[in-house]
């Protein structure tokens, strides 16, 4: 997959919806300039392509949704990379521009005669892409042409700003909510001193900024904050891990507002440096419950607590997907490449035959083996349905009593479609209500996951809690087998009775040394000792002063005992 030739998946229809999926991994650092994408992806790529194709089939066969109108699509590969996604979005725009000029009779042949050539239908809206940074770049382009965009996993808070991103909507909540959920977890376990890492790019940067702001308000100190690109080299991850290690044993918890591949980079560095078990990673939904993040590095990931957008598996998708085979699936142009990559074998006689695999693919191979559904599948499907319902409502309003596309919908006006989409609400694929607020965002519901060793060499994610509209629920016994096992991530231990905190110059407020008050002083507040006034003395608990009772000597009293300094 290089920049010269890009593959596209087409499905014909009366209305065409564009989609950007990360069919391949992002280019590695050395391949960025030529926009050469990485290996093919299953969950984030192929499964999403198939979800789009099959969801449109379901919509088209539903007599109550867009009757007499067929939805088609054009799916392009974003490679989880801004430059690639922009290049692909320009292709969407180009089709639209040619189509609208043709609609207005502006397409003429060189000799001046009118053209009988019919170009592709314009894209009415775009589903995706997955990454926030990439979605921002794509939105900057799409909004110039009034093309609505519905995202299924771009959660950056910046995208809520409708003055900047007017044509952007999403079926997922803004990251402000998961930043709050992460802070609530940190608070729950009294972690007051944590390290912070985020993926360079909009998702990580804005998420971590929110996490840090909220932490400061809650009295949580950040030992140090670091950033790294997901595709950074081994040495960069090693250096980062060594820096995190320098804050041990105090900052055991590492809050990671990170893409999944950033977390994987950290786990791999932990393996190389022999650091498994030294940190507890608290990860955002970029990690969630993905096995492609932890595979091969389970020992390093054990104990990790992650945030996952609430989205149950979609059964009907698996029923469809698991039956797919390379000899019959021709509408997905990446499928043969994926099949060969998934089973590390060669499909003979296919245009995408891969000579790097020695063995030929066996006909008994099936996708059922080690199948894991994309954790965001429900959101991908909901985004597609949102577009369909938006178009349906628009058709009902512009073409009353008419089945199909009436003239009022030719060509489709992006402004009117956006208006219709913003008012859309329907029951999503998992039975929850899908609706959009004034910023085009959806409500926030998260599951809290914990990556655990379930048995010898068997690891898995288990659900240990939830965060729903500001309320955190956690099953502490599931996370920590004993109270004493709760990890401590504090800079300084509480001071003993009669001691005050002295914060060293340049240190954060969570780091102090404990100093006892002088003999005649009491603890005024946690940072100050105050001397008792003459004639009074500190109380036993050193919280105040008591008057010293005055004792008058009478003639008959025995003489007071005096001790010499050299008396032992």
């Amino acid at each position: 997959q290089s920049s010269e030739r890009r593959v596209v998946a087409h499905m014909p229809g009366d209305i065409i919806i564009g989609a950007l999926f990360s069919v391949h991994h992002q280019p590695t650092v050395d391949k960025v300039h030529e926009r050469k994408c990485g290996a093919v992806r299953e969950q984030y790529g192929i499964q999403r392509v198939e979800a789009m194709l099959h969801t449109l089939e379901r919509i088209n066969s539903d007599p109550t949704l867009l009757p007499n109108i067929t939805l088609g699509c054009e799916i392009r590969d974003s490679c989880w990379h801004s430059a690639v996604a922009l290049e692909q979005s320009i292709e969407f725009i180009r089709d639209s521009l040619i189509s609208s000029e043709e609609e207005e009779g502006l397409v003429r042949c060189v000799d001046g005669s009118s053209s009988s050539f019919r170009s592709k239908k314009p894209i009415v809206g775009v589903i995706g892409p997955g990454s926030s940074s990439v979605a921002i770049q794509v939105q900057n382009l799409l909004q110039l042409f009034n093309i609505p965009q519905i995202a299924y996993s771009a959660t950056s808070m910046d995208l809520s700003d409708k003055t900047l991103f007017k044509y952007f909507m999403r079926v997922v909540p803004s990251d402000a909510q998961q930043a709050r959920a992460m802070v609530d977890i940190v608070k729950r376990y009294n972690w007051t001193y944590v390290s912070a890492v985020h993926t360079e790019g909009n998702y990580g940067e804005s998420g971590m900024e929110a996490f840090k702001d909220m932490s400061a308000k809650e009295g949580i100190c950040i030992a140090h904050s670091y950033k790294i690109y997901s595709n950074a080299g081994e040495q960069s991850f090693d250096k980062l891990l060594k820096k995190l290690t320098s804050h041990l044993p105090k900052a055991r918890v590492v809050a990671c507002f990170c893409e999944g591949m950033t977390v994987r980079g950290l786990l791999m560095a932990m393996r190389r440096l022999g650091l498994a078990g030294e940190f507890l990673l608290l990860g955002s939904d970029g990690w969630a419950d993905r096995y492609d993040v932890t595979d091969g590095y389970q020992r390093e990931a054990v104990g990790g607590i992650t945030i996952k957008l609430q989205s149950p598996d979609v059964k009907w998708f698996d029923d469809y997907y698991l039956k797919l085979r390379p000899e019959t699936n021709h509408r997905n142009p990446w499928f043969q490449e994926f099949w060969q990559h998934r089973f590390q074998c060669r499909l003979e006689g296919f245009p995408q035959e891969n000579s790097k695999y020695n063995k030929t693919c066996d006909s008994s191979l099936t996708l059922k083996t080690h199948h894991v559904q994309d954790s965001k599948m429900g959101f991908v499907i909901n985004a597609i349905y949102s577009m369909a319902y938006g178009l349906h409502n628009m058709q009902m309003s512009l073409c009353p009593g008419y089945a199909g596309l009436c003239d009022a919908m030719k060509p489709i006006d992006g402004r009117k479609l956006l208006e219709s989409l913003m008012k859309t609400n329907f029951t999503g694929v998992s039975g929850d209500m899908i609706l959009f607020d004034e910023n085009g965002d959806s409500p926030g519901r998260y599951e809290i996951m914990n990556f655990k060793e379930m048995g010898k060499d068997y690891f898995d994610y288990i659900n240990v809690g939830s965060w729903d509209n500001g309320e955190l629920k956690m099953d502490d016994d599931e996370v920590w087998s004993k109270k004493s096992n709760i990890i401590r991530s504090v800079c300084s231990e509480p001071c003993e009775k009669g001691q005050i905190k002295v914060i060293r110059k340049g240190e954060v407020s969570c780091c102090w040394t404990c100093t006892p008050c002088k003999e005649n002083e009491y603890v005024f507040d946690e940072y100050t000792c105050k001397a008792c006034q003459l004639g009074s003395w500190p109380t036993d608990d050193l919280t105040g002063c008591d008057l010293i009772p005055v004792q008058y000597l009478r003639w008959g009293d025995p003489e007071p005992d005096y001790k010499d300094d050299d008396d032992k």
Epitope: K242, L248, R272, L273, L275, E278
Partner: antibody
């Protein structure tokens, strides 16, 4: 003063077992530095065996040592090395060492004097 | 597994001279390499870590260089007290020592 002292070495029969102990003094295990075992056969070079994290009790082994050698932390100041199925090739001075930084793969800053293990019938 | 190959196995030089010891890693270990000095009957002493950083109390006559798979220890202005066996250690995805180099000072 920081010090590591090994004990438990001696003569052992082939196929026999032995447990070595490393006692640390003047060292705060809570600082997180890893404790390791390195051996040296007479007149030969150094050979890393295993390391343990005093915090998590996680262990790391050289491939050849897996299965026969077990490193463990028995208290806040002692680390042991259990050795089984010993052969003449295991005859060596066994040294306890502390890493320079946190992590199993690190230079060794502090070394014990060593305890000699002789495997012979 | 990580393997460290040290050359030569023995080297001799006159007082005031210079010796160079090489160490090769079986895989890229970046700068994760240490050098030790060991005298007969004594425990090893850390000289260099992270390929070129001098451990505390070590003479500036000792210099480490290299990265990736090729590393060098250079001792200049040799003194009689430098006579010892020197070991390299790679510490990346494992710990491994080189076979050692005996330095004889004439």
């Amino acid at each position: 003063q920081e010090q590591l002292v090994e004990s438990g070495g001696g003569l052992v029969q082939p196929e026999g077992s032995l447990t070595l102990t490393c006692t640390a003094s003047g060292i705060d295990f809570s600082s997180g530095y890893f404790m390791c075992w390195v051996r040296q056969a007479p007149g030969k070079g150094l050979e890393w065996i295993a390391c343990i994290s005093p915090y998590s009790d996680n262990t790391w082994y050289a491939n050849w040592a897996k299965g026969r050698f077990t490193i463990s932390k028995t208290s806040s100041t002692t680390v042991t090395l259990q050795m089984t199925s010993l052969t003449a090739a295991d005859t060596a001075a066994y040294r306890c060492a502390r890493t320079m930084a946190i992590g199993a793969y690190n230079p060794f800053k502090l070394w014990g004097q060593g305890t000699l293990v002789t495997v012979s019938s | 597994a990580l393997v460290m190959t040290q050359t030569p196995s023995s080297v001799s030089a006159a007082v005031g001279g210079t010796v160079t010891i090489n160490c090769q890693a079986s895989q890229n270990i970046y700068s994760n390499l240490a050098w030790y000095q060991q005298k007969p009957g004594q425990r090893p002493k850390l000289l260099i870590y992270d390929a070129s950083d001098l451990a505390s109390g070590v003479s500036s006559r000792v210099k480490g260089s290299g990265s990736g798979t090729e590393f060098t220890l250079t001792i200049s202005d040799l003194e009689c007290a430098d006579a010892a066996t020197y070991y390299c250690q790679g510490y990346y995805s494992g710990n491994a020592f080189g076979g050692g180099t005996e330095v004889v000072v004439k």
